[in-house]
């Protein structure tokens, strides 16, 4: 189920960001992958060019060089290079991060939090992270996500119910109310599909319009042809005729004055019937077998 909620969003204390290839490790840094931002006194796309301040005075580097003069660029703390809530302060040569409890490194990028610090909220279980050098992972209970299980998930927003099922997030569980013809935890099973679906007692499966039905053999009925049909249940014999179940259908024994397969035709007083002719060998009032 690729559309379902991941139970945790990764780990805290992952490796420092990978900067733009060639970015000077001594004079550049990045806040986004593939970026290269220069420390004070350095410039160029890879922060390898020392800034010359001979042409004019610049209160502070890094900068973009213009003809004959240096345009002041952002300070080393602009945009706050300190991760995880660290606070930045400028130093004569670059910057310094004051890291919150549980983080360390040049830019507070390394997590010093361990499982003993109880970083997983909302019932999350802390896995790994036995010491400050190994990162921990929070396994979050269903309904929560984030590095620390701090985010409540609207699991229905990911539309986990298939085939038009209605999603209900009960907090502790997710329910899919399936449309007619579908079943399963995510409404993934198509009950209206003939594939792998047998009709009992010699019935055949017929698909059509996104639904299936069983065309049942004579004498059987119901959704899967499992019920023995009573052909007389619907009172098919008209005008008081009596119905008899028969191995191949039903037979109507007509009341006097009526004839036909279902006793639907009155016999006229002069002996003629409403039918063009009675079937050979049959007199009015004889049982008529319904085919």
């Amino acid at each position: 189920y690729p559309y379902d909620v991941p139970d945790y969003a990764g780990m805290l204390g992952s490796a420092p960001l990978v900067c733009r290839a060639g970015c000077s490790p001594e004079h550049g840094f990045c806040e986004q992958p593939g970026e290269c931002r220069c420390l004070e006194g350095w410039t160029g796309p890879l922060c390898t060019v020392p800034v010359s301040t001979s042409s004019c005075l610049s209160p502070r580097g890094p900068s973009s060089a213009t003809t004959g003069c240096l345009v002041p660029g952002p300070g080393p703390c602009d945009g706050n290079p300190c991760a995880n809530g660290g606070s930045c302060s400028e130093t004569p040569r670059s910057f310094e991060c004051t890291c919150p409890r549980g983080f360390y490194g040049l830019r507070c990028e390394v997590s010093g939090v361990t499982c003993a610090d109880g970083p997983c909220f909302n019932g999350g279980l802390c896995v790994g992270g036995a010491d400050p050098d190994s990162a921990y992972i929070c396994h979050c209970p269903p309904g929560f996500q984030g590095s620390n299980c701090e985010k409540r998930v609207d699991r229905c927003s990911l539309q986990p119910c298939r085939n038009g099922g209605l999603c209900l997030d009960l907090g502790h569980a997710l329910r899919c109310r399936c449309r007619a013809g579908f079943a399963g935890p995510r409404c993934e099973h198509d009950l209206d599909d003939c594939a792998g679906r047998a009709c009992a007692n010699g019935g055949t499966c017929v698909e059509g319009g996104g639904a299936h039905r069983c065309s049942c053999a004579l004498g059987f009925g119901g959704r899967d042809c499992r019920e023995r049909a009573d052909p007389c249940a619907a009172r098919p014999c008209a005008h008081g005729g009596r119905c008899y179940a028969h191995f191949s259908g039903l037979v109507c024994a007509c009341a006097p004055g009526y004839m036909g397969a279902r006793c639907e035709f009155p016999v006229h007083p002069d002996g003629a019937s409403a039918l063009p002719a009675a079937p050979p060998g049959l007199r009015p009032g004889d049982p008529q077998r319904y085919l």
Partner: antibody, heavy 118, light 108 residues
Framework: QVQLQESGPGLVKPSETLSLTCTVS????????WSWIRQPPGKGLEWIAY???????NYNPSLKSRVTISLDTSKNQFSLQLSSVTAADAAVYYC????????????WGQGTMVTVSS | EIVLTQSPGTLSLSPGERATLSCRAS???????LAWYQQNPGQAPRLLIY???SRATGIPDRFSGSGSGTDFTLTISRLEPEDFAVYYC?????????FGGGTKVEIK
């Protein structure tokens, strides 16, 4: 209320692999984590592993090299395999549902006794 | 791993008496993620308490839990005949999940 039922052989030979299956009585298998716990005769409880339908698993380090847990949502089942069994693995094995508010266990199967003997 | 030590190993009491069971952790149990279970002979354990002090569904109010950090207590205010059983604590703050060795509450 949902019910859990363990199934599998009650007798396993030493060095062989123990395979157990737990059947969940309703369609809630995608809503919870599911776990295996064992209890040797006359002793305490030991957690073995848990699994979530997204693929997340977690194993007790003391058993990790020998244990595999898997889940089949279409059958409403999850399974345990424990390889290279010894007499020390003889226990009542329980499957259990992980509570929705933390990794405690709120629904348990009745347990199945596994004996290891040649 | 966090080791849970339960005491006493056996508690002999009479029906109607108060039972106090202890569970001590080798290190801090984060966020009071501690549960208590009851197990009768030949049966599976039953969840009584989670989050150190919250009663699970259908558990009578004579059962109560307390504690934080490394020391936790299960109290049964008035023992009923069906309460004589083995009780286990379990921490679920840090993997691996661990159980205490159990306390048997028997009839005096």
């Amino acid at each position: 209320q949902v019910q859990l039922q363990e199934s599998g052989p009650g007798l396993v030979k030493p060095s062989e692999t123990l395979s157990l299956t737990c059947t969940v009585s309703d369609n809630s298998i995608s809503n919870y984590y599911w776990s295996w716990i064992r209890q040797p005769p006359g002793k305490g409880l030991e957690w073995i592993a848990y699994i979530y339908y997204s693929g997340t698993t977690n194993y007790n380090p003391s058993l990790k090299s020998r244990v595999t847990i898997s889940l089949d949502t279409s059958k409403n089942q999850f399974s345990l395999q424990l390889s290279s069994v010894t007499a020390a693995d003889a226990a009542v094995y329980y499957c259990a549902r992980v509570f929705h508010w933390g990794f405690a266990f709120d629904i348990w199967g009745q347990g199945t006794m596994v004996t290891v003997s040649s | 791993e966090i080791v849970l030590t339960q005491s006493p190993g056996t508690l002999s009491l009479s029906p109607g008496e108060r039972a106090t069971l202890s569970c001590r952790a080798s290190q801090r149990v984060s966020n009071t993620y501690l549960a208590w279970y009851q197990q009768n002979p030949g049966q599976a354990p039953r969840l009584l308490i989670y989050g150190a002090s919250s009663r699970a569904t259908g558990i009578p109010d004579r059962f109560s839990g307390s504690g934080s950090g490394t020391d936790f207590t299960l109290t049964i205010s008035r023992l009923e005949p069906e309460d004589f059983a083995v009780y286990y604590c379990q921490q679920y703050g840090t993997s691996p999940l661990t159980f205490g060795g159990g306390t048997k509450v028997e009839i005096k």
